[in-house]
């Protein structure tokens, strides 16, 4: 129904705690420059103007749309021009194309530091003084880095930090309870940004029946209970959700995901019978909950999916009458069959059903073309599989550091010509998919693997858009989302790639490398992998290894020398002589 | 919607002609193979002919071949069948239909063949 105020209609909704948690985390997306007390500043205008709105609808101003409010905002800031460029250019035209234009000027790499976690006394003092204002801190320098983040869920993760927090503060040893709590917490936070994004890149570039169809398949394996209109209900509620935060409209879509969240709850009869659990929760963890709930149990009678898909001799006929809901229907069926498949396998299942339909329905004898259609997605279920089998066994035998150095190496072979630091961002990435899906039971490696993947590859393709430099990505990238992760995994050596001279200054270490943190020594360490690769990329995986030991070793020497300064600079040159012998 | 509605049919006498036509709506015609089948007094439906979407491709039964002609404009949205040499035995509704389908999903003409 339609509000006279839009602005008094979302507080209303939203409560103020909410209301102004999602306008900061707007603004943090839009200007990602800006510092926290200039957009708290303009977060607080706003809000006081929503309440005059509420005391009187009629009011001023009140009847303007949220994108003409919260644009003329952004627009009134001084310096504009200075501090974002061309993205004052936005502020010369008209809605809705200034929103588009904003949304344009999102920088999905942005330069600014990495968010660094104060020490924990130091946390818990200013957390103790204005809990209010250090939630404020965290949702702004997460939404500024990740301009896509899901605003409802960056709530939530907001939420879960202050009840960490709460906890750990009143501890005696506050880092020990902290640390562990909190690494949880951003592991969690940044998983939640990749997938995200990955949804609004569909969106943005294939459009909302794209998104659509991941829906159907998603929501058809968690619910297989759930009938195909139910599961058209919810795959197009979501579909305008992530369509409202993805196009920066983040009140209507807090909004509407938590009226989402209360239909599901209010009629779980229908969906599944494993959301009460979630359920029973406050607002924020009910909505976090249901988008991560477990599979509901099969239904044991399903018939065999030949049936209505091959066997029918009404095929074309159904296809042609209703193309979107026929192959939505195949979707479903197939999906609700299958929850150890990727969403993105499943999407590809599809896509060769559509593809094999076009084709045999146009012929005299439709029936007998079809009729192997189902045979034909053997190949197709059986490489991801096989890359699954691979990796995990890699990843057993190597660990997480040695499976990142393995696809740092296959990468900077199939990109070379790509930045180390975004290779050696992705190779840790993709290399983290170990940890978090190999340990799994079977059957939920697959589709935990699979759709990590894609949503990490989906990073390095935006990333590698700013700047394009290898035709290898840009040739897997183009196309559809669901096929880019075969495609990278079957690229190989980039044959076309003057190897890189090798410089002695890019291998050349010295004592501050010892006091880092382990993460920064394996970075550091991994930089040297890629350039070694870039160096030689048909170096053998000995040769590699020869090296990375022989370099391992010598960084332990040294680190561990009473003299570290000399041992850096007479023990080095001798490891760089070492290193071009061995990959001579 | 989908919609086909099918014409010419009529009474005729052994060894005359008749040419049925199909008018097809509501999909892209083009991209879609298209069939006739019949249907006689107190029998089950019965395949005729077959036509792939561009027109290169046709498929008769037994029954047909060497007096059926299988046709399609799809300029026109419109599928054809030329029966010359009709026998009694052809009498039966005939019915245009998608793809490789037998089934009825539209009214159909009648044929009668008699002397």
């Known amino acids: 129904e339609a509000h006279k105020s839009e602005i008094a209609h979302r507080y209303n909704d939203l409560g103020e705690q909410h209301f102004k948690g999602l306008v900061l985390i707007a603004f943090s997306q839009y200007l990602q420059k800006c510092s926290y007390d200039e957009h708290a500043k303009l977060v607080q205008e706003v809000t006081d103007f929503a309440k005059t709105c509420v005391a009187d609808e009629s009011a001023a101003n009140c009847d303007k749309s949220l994108h003409t409010l919260f644009g003329d905002k952004l627009c009134a800031i001084p310096n504009l021009r200075e501090n974002y460029g061309e993205l004052a250019d936005c502020c010369t035209k008209q809605e809705p194309e200034r929103n588009e234009c904003f949304l344009q000027h999102k920088d999905d790499n942005p330069s600014l530091p990495p968010f660094e976690r104060p020490e924990a006394e130091a946390m818990c003092t200013s957390f103790k003084e204005n809990p209010t204002t250090f939630m404020g801190h965290y949702l702004h320098e997460v939404a500024r880095r990740h301009p896509y983040f899901y605003a409802p869920e960056l709530l939530y993760y907001a939420e879960q930090y202050n009840e960490i927090l709460t906890q750990c503060c009143a501890e005696a040893d506050k880092e020990s309870c902290l640390t562990p709590k909190l690494d949880g917490v951003k592991e969690k936070a940044l998983v939640s940004s990749v997938r995200q994004r990955m949804k609004c890149s569909s969106m943005q570039k294939f459009g909302e029946r794209a998104f659509k169809a991941w829906a159907v398949a998603r929501l058809s394996q968690t619910f297989p209970n759930a009938d195909f209109a139910e599961i058209t209900k919810l795959a197009t509620d979501l579909t305008k959700v992530n369509k409202e935060c993805c196009h920066g409209d983040l009140l209507e879509c807090a909004d509407d995901r938590a009226e989402l969240a209360k239909y599901m709850c209010e009629n779980q009869a229908t969906i599944s019978s494993k959301l009460q659990t979630c359920c029973d929760k406050p607002l924020l963890k009910k909505a976090h909950c249901l988008s991560e709930v477990e599979h509901d149990t099969m239904p044991a009678d399903l018939p065999a999916i030949a049936a209505d898909f091959v066997e029918d001799q009404e095929v074309c006929k159904n296809y042609a009458e209703a193309k979107d809901v026929f192959l939505g229907t195949f979707l479903y069926e197939y999906s609700r069959r299958h929850p150890d498949y990727s969403v993105s396998l499943l999407l590809r299942l599809a896509k060769k059903y559509e593809a094999t339909l076009e084709k045999c329905c146009a012929e005299a004898n439709p029936p007998a073309c079809y009729g192997t259609v189902l045979a034909e997605f053997q190949p197709l279920v059986e490489e991801p599989k096989n890359l699954v089998k691979t990796n995990c066994d890699l990843y057993e035998k190597l660990g997480e550091y040695g499976f990142q150095n393995a696809i740092l190496v296959r990468y900077t072979q199939k990109a070379p010509q790509v930045s180390t630091p975004t290779l050696v961002e992705a190779a840790r990435n993709l290399g983290r998919v170990g940890t978090k899906c190999c340990t799994l039971p079977e059957d939920q490696r697959l589709p935990c693997v699979e759709d990590y993947l894609s949503a990490i590859l989906n990073r390095v393709c935006l990333l590698h858009e700013k700047t394009p430099v290898s035709e290898h990505v840009t040739k897997c990238c183009s196309g559809s989302l669901v096929e880019r992760r075969p495609c990278f995994s079957a690229l190989t050596v980039d044959e076309t790639y003057v190897p890189k001279e090798f410089k002695a200054e890019t291998f050349t270490f010295h004592s501050d490398i010892c006091t880092l943190p382990e993460k920064e020594k394996q970075i550091k360490k991994q930089t040297a992998l890629a350039e070694l690769v870039k160096h030689k990329p048909k170096a053998t995986a000995e040769q590699l290894k020869t090296v990375m030991d022989d370099f391992a070793q010598f960084l332990d020497t040294c680190c561990k020398a009473a003299d570290k300064d000399t041992c850096f600079s007479t023990e080095g040159p001798n490891l760089v002589t070492r290193c071009k012998d061995a990959l001579a | 919607k989908v919609q086909l509605v099918e014409s010419g049919g009529g009474l005729v006498q052994p060894g005359n002609s008749l040419r049925l036509s199909c008018a097809a709506s509501g999909f892209t015609f083009s991209s879609f193979g298209m069939s006739w089948v019949r249907q006689a007094p107190g029998k089950g439906l019965e395949w005729v002919s077959s036509?792939?979407?561009?027109?290169?491709?046709?498929l008769y039964a037994d029954s047909a071949k060497g007096r059926f002609t299988i046709s399609r404009d799809n300029s026109k949205n419109t599928l054809y069948l030329q029966m010359n040499s009709l026998r009694p035995e052809d009498t039966a509704v005939y019915y245009c239909t998608i793809g490789g389908s037998l089934s009825r999903s539209s009214q159909g003409t009648l044929v009668t063949v008699s002397s």
């Open positions: 036509i792939s979407g561009s027109g290169g491709d046709t």
